[in-house]
């Protein structure tokens, strides 16, 4: 189980996974860009089983999903931190 918590840098991800997570197991995804005291982009996946996983932003599967989300929300202006519920 991957740990997620706040550090003095306000980064939350201690470990990152690149493993594909099927959509039916995902509750929501939070994408935090660099900044706000954390020098790296963080992607946090909340799963329906109540566990939380930090995903490597370079992982191919999450980039594909992010691209899909970008296309879906292209009509709305970007926000610095957002959560997307996975249908």
């Amino acid at each position: 189980v991957l740990e997620v918590y706040y550090t003095h840098l306000r980064c939350r991800c201690v470990q990152e996974s690149s493993v594909f997570i099927p959509r039916r197991f995902i509750d929501r995804i939070q994408i935090s860009p660099r900044g706000n005291g954390c020098p790296r982009k963080e992607i946090i996946v909340w799963k329906k089983n109540k566990s939380v996983v930090c995903v490597d932003p370079q992982a191919e599967w999450i980039q594909r999903i992010m691209e899909m989300l970008r296309k879906k929300s292209s009509s709305t202006p970007p926000v610095p931190v957002f959560k997307r519920k996975i249908p």
Partner: antibody, heavy 120, light 107 residues
Framework: EVKLLQSGGGLVQPGGSLKLSCAAS????????MSWVRRAPGKGLEWIGE????????NYAPSLKDKFIISRDNAKNTLYLQMSKVRSEDTALYYC?????????????WGQGTSVTVSS | DIVMTQSHKSMSTSVGDRVSITCKAS??????VAWYRQKPGQSPKLLIY???YRYTGVPDRFTGSGSGTDFTFTISSVQAEDLAVYYC?????????FGAGTKLELK
């Protein structure tokens, strides 16, 4: 050590019913999705369906959902497959498998299989 | 349903050979693909998950690659115990589906 011990297979007549069981040990059964998969003679693996930990979500292969019912009893650490209106094409080896949703997201543990033969 | 097509029903090989099995999905499954091995009289065993990750205890002669619709499973140096049927499976979405299987046999 994780074990999935299957039982309940056997000979059943066309149109009949049968209930397969899969008893889990060595895992916190109530935390995991579980699946049923079968392999007919000379054929490949076919997914039957899956059930989530609290039984609130059950997904079936569309062609099988009207004749098979997947259930579980977490108090008994046991998964079930109720088969009804069976036909000769349901003759197969039936496997239960853990559908991991923590680390691998694939079927990482399998039962030994139980044979079902549909014949008059 | 997503159809997983394994182009070869069987493949002949020799001990020490490098062999690759291909699998094509009928639609994009991202990297939601696993590979299993089934020996006669045994249950399937998970070898590869998330298209390219080796499952615990799986020797490094087994590798997987691909994303989207095209996937490959490779054994870099076939051993006698590798003679079995290999299945790809997509777990991107339900219904989960398997390829028809590729039987690896000796020449």
């Amino acid at each position: 050590e994780v074990k999935l011990l299957q039982s309940g297979g056997g000979l059943v007549q066309p149109g009949g019913s049968l209930k397969l069981s899969c008893a889990a040990s060595g895992i916190d059964f109530s935390r995991y999705w579980m699946s049923w998969v079968r392999r007919a003679p000379g054929k490949g693996l076919e997914w039957i369906g899956e059930i989530n930990p609290d039984s609130s979500t059950i997904n079936y292969a569309p062609s099988l959902k009207d004749k098979f019912i997947i259930s579980r009893d977490n108090a008994k650490n046991t998964l079930y497959l109720q088969m009804s209106k069976v036909r000769s094409e349901d003759t197969a080896l039936y496997y239960c498998a853990r559908q991991d949703d923590y680390e691998y997201y694939a079927m990482d543990y399998w039962g030994q299989g139980t044979s079902v033969t549909v014949s008059s | 349903d997503i159809v997983m097509t394994q182009s070869h029903k069987s493949m002949s090989t020799s001990v020490g050979d490098r062999v690759s099995i291909t699998c094509k999905a009928s639609q994009d499954v991202n990297t939601g693909v696993a590979w299993y091995r089934q020996k006669p009289g045994q249950s399937p065993k998970l070898l590869i998950y998330s298209a390219s990750y080796r499952y615990t205890g799986v020797p490094d002669r087994f590798t997987g690659s691909g994303s989207g619709t095209d996937f490959t499973f490779t054994i870099s140096s076939v051993q006698a115990e590798d003679l079995a049927v290999y299945y790809c499976q997509q777990y991107y979405s339900t219904p989960l589906t398997f390829g028809a299987g590729t039987k690896l046999e000796l020449k």
